[in-house]
Interface confidence: low
């Protein structure tokens, strides 16, 4: 498994992980304590056939072309957590780790 | 977690679970003992703002809209695997379970 | 509160267009589908289509496809249906209503609000 | 395309009544079916989802039923203020399909 790594000012068109920082003070987002910022990243791009594909089961959808299958897209494929401080709705603060906040690989599924 | 099913008559328009048997005797692909045709599914539609996306991170990165970021798409969020009996590169008939062959849910990511 | 408010009357002559505006308040205009039904006079409800604000995809009914766009501004939260080559029996009120989803059934929605309408007169 | 048949396409009643109005389709919509009231000069209100449930607001003297083809709209006790256009809609395939309407008059 491996998957594209760009920045902003890459060529690169076809699916690729981008650099992107979460901001939650800048989204007014006052009840995360920390961290008030993190790199979150994303994934943007074109999937071509056969690149990147995560499983074979994308080739099969592809092959047989069903009505309204749009082909595959460019989509996390491995994702990271990260720990968090923040109110819950009790207004108690909590410590966590939080699943899938960070966007590791990007793939075309 | 849960994903919407739909058939090709249904007038959904969102991110929903379609039945779909891949045949592989149409594929072509003789070197598949067994099974010749298998219920496959696949995912297709819009996927709306916070409509079943299974991370955070995918409603974060729609916050923070980054230059080329195309929006959550639909696609498989849950998988299981197949027992398949073929032939591998050397000829050899091989018994294994293959992952990821048939898509369980779909989601927004 | 949710409201959905339609442009004024339009007078076309035919093999003209018409462009209608719906402009929504009070919710998240991309969160929700579009739909645009119209009525000739004395005569039943017809649906024409409808859009989905949050990526422009439309859906258009088979016997309008040739001759009507369905778009969306999303920084007016405007939804706008324009019909082509106008006819005499294109005369009718057009209504913009939204599709309000309740369920986890694909078809699990009603169309909960609905425009004020706008009336199209083509006539020569 | 699925086709809506409603019945009758105009009825009198006096207030005080109860009326039911029918609406059959062409195939099986799986009780995804909608009635709307419509008032001359104005927008259509829904009343009706899903065959059998009651949208906000509406009074519980509006009723519905029906599965598979066929499909009713009861109003138990007219008043004066349900004199209107009653249609069914299918939203079970596309096209949308809307019934030909129910016109009810007072008598």
């Known amino acids: 498994d491996f998957g594209l790594d760009c920045d902003e000012h890459s060529t690169e068109s076809r699916c690729c992980r981008y650099p992107l920082t979460v901001d939650f003070e800048a989204f007014g987002w006052d009840w995360i304590i920390a961290p008030k910022r993190y790199k979150a990243n994303y994934c943007s791009g074109e999937c071509e056939f056969v690149f990147l594909q995560k499983y074979p089961h994308t080739h099969l959808v592809h092959q047989a072309n069903p009505r309204g299958s749009a082909g595959p897209c460019c989509t996390p494929t491995k994702m990271s957590p990260i720990n968090m401080l923040y109110f819950n709705g009790k207004e108690q603060i909590i410590y966590g780790k939080i699943p899938a906040m960070v966007v590791d690989r990007c793939g075309c599924s | 977690d849960f994903g919407l099913d739909c058939d090709e008559h249904s007038t959904e328009s969102r991110c929903c679970r379609y039945p779909l048997t891949v045949d592989f005797e149409a594929f072509g692909w003789d070197w598949i003992i067994a099974p010749k045709r298998y219920k496959a599914n696949y995912c297709s539609g819009e996927c709306e703002f916070v409509f079943l996306q299974k991370y955070p991170h995918t409603h974060l990165v729609h916050q923070a809209n980054p230059r080329g970021s195309a929006g959550p798409c639909c696609t498989p969020t849950k998988m299981s695997p197949i027992n398949m009996l073929y032939f591998n590169g050397k000829e050899q008939i091989i018994y294994g379970k293959i992952p990821a062959m048939v898509v369980d849910r779909c989601g927004c990511s | 509160q949710v409201q959905l408010v339609q442009s004024g009357a339009e007078v076309k002559k035919p093999g003209a267009s018409v462009k209608v505006s719906c402009k929504a308040s009070?919710?998240?205009?991309?969160?929700?589908?579009m739909h645009w039904v119209r009525q000739a006079p004395g005569q039943g409800l017809e649906w024409m289509g409808n859009?989905?604000?949050?990526?422009?995809?439309?859906n258009y009914n088979q016997r309008f496809k040739a001759r009507v766009t369905m778009t969306t501004d999303t920084s007016t939260s405007t939804a706008y249906m324009e019909l082509r080559s106008l006819r005499s029996d294109d005369t009718a009120v057009y209504y913009c209503?939204?599709?309000?989803?309740?369920?986890?059934?694909?078809?699990?929605?009603?169309?909960?609000?609905w425009g004020q309408g706008t009336l199209v007169t083509v006539s020569s | 395309d699925i086709q809506m048949t409603q019945s009758p396409s105009s009825l009198s009643a006096s207030v005080g009544d109860r009326v039911t109005i029918t609406c059959k389709a062409s195939?099986?919509?799986?009780?995804?079916l909608s009635w709307f009231q419509q008032k001359p000069g104005k927008a259509p209100k829904s009343l009706i989802y899903?065959?059998?449930r009651l949208v906000d607001g509406v009074p519980s003297k509006f009723s519905g039923s029906g599965s598979g083809t066929d499909y009713t709209l009861t109003i138990s006790s007219l008043q004066p203020e349900d004199f209107a256009t009653y249609y069914c809609?299918?939203?079970?395939?596309?096209?949308?399909?809307f019934g030909q309407g129910t016109k009810l008059e007072i008598k």
């Open positions: 209503a939204r599709r309000y989803y309740y369920g986890t059934k694909p078809a699990d929605w009603y169309f909960d609000v």
């Open positions: 009070g919710y998240s205009f991309t969160g929700y589908f």
């Open positions: 859009i989905y604000p949050y990526n422009g995809v439309s």
């Open positions: 195939q099986d919509i799986n009780s995804y």
């Open positions: 899903r065959a059998n």
């Open positions: 809609l299918q939203s079970d395939e596309f096209p949308l399909t």
